[in-house]
């Protein structure tokens, strides 16, 4: 039975040109995390495999950095980076857990005026 839950940073915002850390945390289960996939809509950003290490998609290698931990750092943000991001945890023996983060990338001037999502 799958008892775990994924905690995420929820809805977040960041300034264009800046960077942001995407973080998920799996709790309430003793299942072993074997792999975490990071996806933007249906596009793979990165994989962190417990045994093989990181795979960063070549399309994003110049502006995606692994970590911290199982998280992912997005750099040189553009408005096009606005959207949904998913962390997909493969675990043993539970199976797959998925978390969702919504990122809005704001023009610097807008961000300075406090138009930000609150983290629930």
């Amino acid at each position: 039975m799958m008892t775990g839950t994924i905690e995420t940073t929820g809805n977040i915002s960041a300034e264009k040109g800046g960077s942001i850390i995407l973080q998920c945390h799996l709790s309430s289960t003793t299942a072993q995390v074997t792999q975490v996939n990071w996806e933007q809509q249906d596009q793979l950003l990165a994989i962190c495999n417990a045994d093989l290490g990181w795979h960063i998609s070549p399309s994003f290698k110049d502006r995606v950095a692994p970590g911290p931990g199982l998280g992912l750092t997005l750099q040189s943000l553009t408005v096009n980076d606005t959207g949904e991001y998913f962390c997909i945890y493969h675990t043993y023996p539970d199976g797959t857990y998925t978390g969702r983060i919504f990122l809005e990338v704001l023009e610097s001037s807008v961000a300075e005026h406090g138009a930000r999502f609150q983290i629930p």
Epitope: I47, N49, L52, H55, S57, P58, S59, K61, Y92, T96
Partner: antibody, heavy 119, light 107 residues
């Protein structure tokens, strides 16, 4: 066009080391991880390890961990695999193979380098 | 290590007929399975990754299916140039391991 061109065949004595090179072209070398896989005569393919050419970080098959070293030279877009303490069972064709876009499989392979270990 | 087995060891199929190769894995690898084709004296060539995604430039007579521990590669209409050994490989953990191969010939 993606190309992985490997160094020529080698004949080595037991106990010696061999270093095989793999020159990449047709893509951005540092954006794609590189794997090394070998195939002994009549045997299945055997994965040896992988490297991130950007950071130099590598992961190895535990079976080879004490004997294999995978390195890169970013300036020449070349990957290297060195295997030490050679024995007759290491006689095989050694392949470099580029990691794919979407995971740890390999989408392009070098032509292979035959390494013969014989006294 | 994750153990890969393939069946059959070899098969002979008439031109234009269907060829089916199975790969069984010792533990759940979700859909992290690749198929390669290796012709005599050549390097392996990627056909399928993530169990069912066809690699660039691969003819659509090839298809992959399955998830978990059981996977299949199908050649819907065998052509003369398909004579080769076919290997499955999981791409899920260390070490990456390959099946023993299935040799496909023309009947």
């Amino acid at each position: 066009e993606v190309q992985l061109v490997q160094s020529g065949a080698e004949v080595k004595k037991p106990g010696a080391s061999v270093k095989v090179s793999c020159k990449a072209s047709g893509y951005t070398f540092t954006n794609y991880y590189m794997h090394w896989v070998r195939q002994a005569p009549g045997q299945r393919l055997e994965w040896m390890g992988r490297i991130d050419p950007d950071s130099g970080g590598s992961k190895y098959n535990e079976k080879f961990k004490s004997r294999v070293t995978i390195t890169v030279d970013k300036l020449s877009s070349t990957a290297y695999m060195e295997l030490s303490s050679l024995r007759s069972e290491d006689t095989a064709v050694y392949y470099c193979a580029r990691e794919g876009h979407y995971g740890f499989y390999s989408d392009y392979w070098g032509q292979g380098t035959t390494v013969t270990v014989s006294s | 290590d994750i153990v890969m087995t393939q069946s059959p060891d070899s098969l002979a199929v008439s031109l234009g007929e269907r060829a089916t190769i199975n790969c069984r894995v010792s533990e759940n690898i979700y859909s992290y399975l690749a198929w390669y084709q290796q012709k005599p004296g050549q390097s392996p060539k990627l056909l399928v990754y993530n169990a069912k995604t066809l690699a660039e430039g691969v003819p659509d007579r090839f298809s992959g299916s399955g998830s978990g521990t059981d996977f299949t590669l199908t050649i819907s209409s065998l052509q003369a140039e398909d004579v080769a050994v076919y290997y499955c490989q999981h791409h899920y953990g260390n070490p990456l391991t390959f099946g023993p191969g299935t040799k496909v010939d023309i009947k």
